[in-house]
């Protein structure tokens, strides 16, 4: 058992049939000695008497808010939450496995550049009686500071009969060094409490591995005289790290016909312009990736050929 | 370069970009294969890293590129020795078409561009003997290549920026 915050405790339980559970001793926070009784949640049923109450916590029915009273007056409260461990693995019932980039991915994080700022998000089908807290650091044995902002509900989606909620948080490394080679990973820890269930989730990554640039901006097409070819140009996204001579991008360009089945030729270039054949009803697209490190490609930026 | 002369920025840029390509073809990203484990904070101390105070940022390069170039060269020699060690030459054997050989040669080539014959900067101690088990050796190869990818990415940025802004 450990204290999450004042008067709120997490009981760690091995969860299997006929498990013995954990013995917990609650102490009433009062100088009084006599006439003390204990109740659980809104029930008026007296569970025991005396300054301490010993309970065997085995299941969710044993968790909740315990109150000690004297003469009808509440003296103190203790809220017990449960953290389940099944077959040596902590439960992950609250958040949804996003399965990307691999199974058991509950937290996903991305960065638009090397500034030390990143966003993490997670999914759940639970709407009410659900709270989170987030902590982050660089390294774990001698952690360096990372400051995270508010967790906000960033999207709601209907998936069949279920509603899915996406929560996200933005964090910033306190002393980021964009040009250095990261040695220690960023650690992100999210704890989730649903009703009386406590769970925690962690993600560990280097910023370089979660980089995903914004799409290139200002796509422009200039037809070349007496030719089927057009000159296309684009610019680095505003959110990308500067100077661009140091933080360089590479680009993938393609012309996509109206039919999705039509063969697409992809060309890779480090330049911000190219000459392509752009037929009517087709569209030109470009995406960006760090030139020297194979992190994610940006989403496509597109413009119609006509 | 030693003694304060400028490197052949454009040549270094080309070779470092080639190194990036080779490092990724030697160990492509296998579904974000997570090779970090408990205690990795200690094991990562073994390899040289380009750190914040090494002057490899744009401002540091403008002020005095020598500190950064020396750090890069130390790292190149370190990795070149690693790729030539029995971690890579021992069992399990590399495939005949493995890019590790090319990678090894390119590391050597770039380190020599940074230090012509006759000049000697002190280099970092090369790591202790490799593990005996083939599976351990395989895992170590992956970790070294992942670490090398990060190192050469920073080096390539340095040379690209140098070629664009510091070339005579």
């Amino acid at each position: 058992i450990w204290e999450l915050k004042k008067d709120v405790y997490v009981v760690e339980l091995d969860w299997y049939p006929d498990a013995p559970g954990e013995m917990v001793v609650l102490t009433c926070d009062t100088p009084e000695e006599d006439g003390i009784t204990w109740t659980l949640d809104q029930s008026g049923e007296v569970l025991g008497s005396g300054k301490t109450l010993t309970i065997q916590v085995k299941e969710f029915g044993d968790a909740g808010q315990y109150t000690c009273h004297k003469g009808g007056e509440a003296l103190s409260h203790s809220l017990l939450l449960l953290h389940k461990k099944e077959d040596g693995i902590w439960s992950t019932d609250v958040l949804k496995d996003q399965k990307e980039p691999k199974n058991k991915t509950f937290l996903r994080c991305e960065a638009k550049n090397y500034s030390g700022r990143f966003t993490c998000w997670w999914l759940t089908t639970i709407s009410t009686d659900l709270t989170f807290s987030v902590k982050s650091s660089r390294g774990s044995s001698n952690p360096q500071g990372v400051t995270c902002g508010a967790v906000t509900l960033s999207a709601e989606r209907v998936r069949g009969d279920n509603k899915e909620y996406e929560y996200s948080v933005e964090c910033q490394e306190d002393s980021a060094c964009p040009a250095a080679e990261e040695r220690l990973p960023i650690e992100v820890m999210v704890d989730a409490i649903h009703k009386l269930k406590y769970e925690n989730y962690t993600s560990s990554f280097f910023i370089r591995d979660i980089i995903k640039p914004d799409p290139p901006k200002n796509l422009q097409l200039k037809p070349l005289k007496n030719s089927r070819q057009v000159e296309v140009s684009w610019e680095y996204p505003d959110t990308w790290s500067t100077p661009h001579s140091y933080f360089s991008l590479t680009f993938c360009i393609q012309v996509q016909g109206k039919s999705k089945r039509e063969k697409k030729d992809r060309i890779f270039t480090d330049k911000t312009s190219a000459t392509v054949i752009c037929r009517k009803n087709a569209s030109f697209s470009v995406q960006a990736q760090d030139r020297y490190y194979s992190s994610s490609w940006s989403e496509w930026a597109s413009v119609p050929c006509s | 370069v030693p003694g304060g002369s400028s490197p052949a920025w454009a040549q270094c840029q080309q070779l470092s970009q080639k190194l990036c390509t080779l490092a990724w073809s030697a160990h492509p990203l296998v579904g974000h294969m997570d090779l970090r484990e408990e205690g990795d904070e200690e094991t990562t101390n073994d390899v040289p890293h380009i750190q914040c105070g090494d002057g490899c940022d744009p401002q540091g390069l403008r002020d005095n590129s020598q500190f950064c170039l020396q750090r890069i060269r130390q790292g190149l020699i370190f990795y070149e020795k690693l790729l030539g060690s029995d971690i890579f030459t021992g069992e399990p054997s590399l495939l005949p078409d493995s890019p590790v050989g090319q990678l090894h040669a390119s590391l050597l080539g770039l380190s020599q561009l940074l230090q012509p014959e006759g000049h000697h900067w002190e280099t970092q101690q090369i790591p202790s003997p490799s593990p005996s088990q083939p599976w351990q050796r395989l895992l170590l190869r992956f970790k070294i290549l992942r670490s090398l990818q990060a190192f050469v990415a920073v080096a390539a940025r340095v040379f690209a920026h140098g070629a664009a802004t510091l070339s005579p």
């Epitope: 709407s127 009410t128 989170f132 807290s133 508010a150 509900l153 909620y165 | -």
Partner: nanobody, 125 residues
Framework: EVQLVESGGGLVQAGGSLRLSCAAS????????MGWFRQASGKKREFVAS????????SYADSVKGRFTISRDNAKNTVYLQMNSLKPEDTAVYYC?????FGSGSYYDLMYDYWGQGTQVTVSS
């Protein structure tokens, strides 16, 4: 210093309506859920309603569902409780609460970190 100040309580006849307000000062509760609890004389403090930061996720005690509506105005840093079809058993001191955690809120008062001083609501029959 964080302060939550409730207002809008008073005496009302059964079937009537009241609107409680809770103004927060000292910090913005961006991302933080807020809630209303009540305590009748000689009884335990009980959950009434909670609302997330966006205002899109609300939760109510069964006893007030369909009669009470919780809402919030983040620009004013204020949360409201519109109480319709009031009954004598709604008589209690109503407390506003805010959590330092994020999400949609909790039924448990110990999960809230900041409290107002309370406003009395009396429903006469």
């Amino acid at each position: 210093e964080v302060q939550l100040v409730e207002s809008g309580g008073g005496l009302v006849q059964a079937g009537g309506s009241l609107r409680l307000s809770c103004a927060a000062s000292g910090r913005t509760f961006e991302g933080n859920p807020m809630g209303w609890f009540r305590q009748a004389s000689g009884k335990k403090r009980e959950f009434v309603a909670s609302i997330d930061w966006s205002g899109g996720i609300t939760s109510y005690a069964d006893s007030v569902k369909g009669r009470f509506t919780i809402s919030r105005d983040n620009a004013k840093n204020t949360v409201y409780l519109q109480m319709n079809s009031l009954k004598p058993e709604d008589t209690a001191v109503y407390y506003c609460a805010a959590s330092a955690r994020f999400g949609s809120g909790s039924y448990y008062d110990l999960m809230y970190d900041y409290w107002g001083q309370g406003t009395q609501v009396t429903v006469s029959s």
